[in-house]
Amino acid sequence: AQNITARIGEPLVLKCKGAPKKPPQRLEWKLNTGRTEAWKVLSPQGGGPWDSVARVLPNGSLFLPAVGIQDEGIFRCQAMNRNGKETKSNYRVRVYQIPGKPEIVDSASELTAGVPNKVGTCVSEGSYPAGTLSWHLDGKPLVPNEKGVSVKEQTRRHPETGLFTLQSELMVTPARGGDPRPTFSCSFSPGLPRHRALRTAPIQPRVWEPVPLEEVQLVVEPEGGAVAPGGTVTLTCEVPAQPSPQIHWMKDGVPLPLPPSPVLILPEIGPQDQGTYSCVATHSSHGPQESRAVSISIIEPGEEGPTAGSVGGSGLGTLALA
């Protein structure tokens, strides 16, 4: 059978080979399509409700005024010329519809490096057969399930027209230190060959690089945190991040009721100041970060200062913030 591809809604003419060019003609068309059960016979005399779908023209050709999805199938003509020679024509008709240009909806303007992000949803409406959607990064195809790329697809069929709507949601995990303005696009590839792909307008989200969280350093003077009664201890919270975060202080796991400051001075140390101290840096972009804890202890004259003193009383004594 000869393969014929016809666009939905367009007319189609199928030639009946060997048919006399004008009546009287001995020919018959048989069709087996979505509109028929087994074979439907159409003759040149025809003329009837089937004319809305297919009718035999005076030259013996079969004319379909507006091809529909239900017209996919087999069309056969059997004709006899004036000399009694029989000729058969056999066609396999497939139909197609090109959708409108695909679009990317719900697109992200900003992506975060190192974590999965939804880039957007590509939508194609009105195709037949369904066809496929694919994503591109900087013009190169993106392969799902590779290098942090995942795609969620959905296909719906219109209950009346039978045409397809395709949706494809793209998730990516941009690499740190990669392209700060990647270009994403989506293309629709028709289900029938010989039809070029349709591509969306590109989108260019910014990639935001979160500053790597460097450790919050707590420096204590004197080193080791052991001090004679009445001495002074200085705790300094060092945070490399910019802009400078807010620094709060903790003692024995409880926040100290003090205004934010990167330096905590404990003058005239007494037993009530002994304990475990840490600082907490709060960044606007990624929450609080706590330093290691250090122990502050009192040593009597002549004692060796321990690196980690035991926890003492809970009194605050006198605190000074630089």
Partner: antibody, heavy 119, light 107 residues
């Protein structure tokens, strides 16, 4: 909402003529075949004529062929039935209906107009 | 021309009854048969299209079936508003042919 409104019926003498009209609204008129169906008093339904959406092809049963002519004006969303050489047996309510083809056969009907052929 | 032989021509039934009306085509008409309901003084209303499909707005107690050239309209539980005349229509070929009608009356 699809609406079909017939007009032009009335009393006519045998051998006379009458022209029925059908005004269509609520759908894209030139996309559809149109049909006239009639019903004699106390009788069943009988197909009278059909026309394709372009108006190029018309179809009739033998009982009215050569006497009745179906036509349409797509610009005016109107369907017509020109009835000549009327006979007593043409007395009926005439309905205009959308469709009559394989794709869409008579889902919508007008309320009908009565044609009486009598001397 | 195709003949559509409809039976019975009339029937009496009660509310709640199951009612079956049949049309037999004189030759193969595929699935191209519709069923209509008509009440006195009103235009016909399409109930079933292409043998088995329920038209929009038609109650689900109506159904259509086909076996070869035999077409059946079934009302599963007759309601008071269903007392009317029912017609089948063949539209596979011209002339379009209606069945003779079945009048459903109250018993």
């Amino acid at each position: 909402e699809v609406q079909l409104v017939e007009s032009g019926g009335g009393l006519v003498q045998p051998g006379g003529s009458l022209r029925l009209s059908c005004a269509a609204s609520g759908f894209t008129f030139n996309n559809y075949w149109m049909t006239w169906v009639r019903q004699a008093p106390g009788k069943g339904l009988e197909w009278v004529a059909s026309i394709d959406n372009s108006g190029d092809n018309t179809y009739y049963p033998d009982s009215v062929k050569d006497r009745f002519t179906i036509s349409r004006d797509n610009a005016k969303n109107s369907l017509y039935l020109q009835m000549n050489s009327l006979r007593a047996e043409d007395t009926a309510v005439y309905y205009c209906a959308r469709g009559g083809d394989i794709l869409d056969s008579l889902p919508y009907w007008g309320q009908g107009t009565l044609v009486t052929v009598s001397s | 021309d195709i003949q559509m032989t409809q039976s019975p021509s009339s029937l009496s039934a009660s509310v709640g009854d199951r009612v079956t009306i049949t049309c037999r085509a004189s030759q193969d008409v595929g699935i191209y048969v519709n069923w209509f309901q008509q009440k006195p003084g009103k235009a016909p209303r399409r109930l079933i299209y292409r043998a088995t499909n329920l038209a929009d707005g038609v109650p689900s107690r109506f159904s259509g079936s086909r076996s070869g050239t035999d077409f059946t309209l079934t009302i599963s539980s007759l309601q008071p508003e269903d007392f009317a005349t029912y017609y089948c229509l063949e539209f596979d070929e011209h002339p379009l042919t209606f069945g003779g009608g079945t009048k459903v009356e109250i018993k």
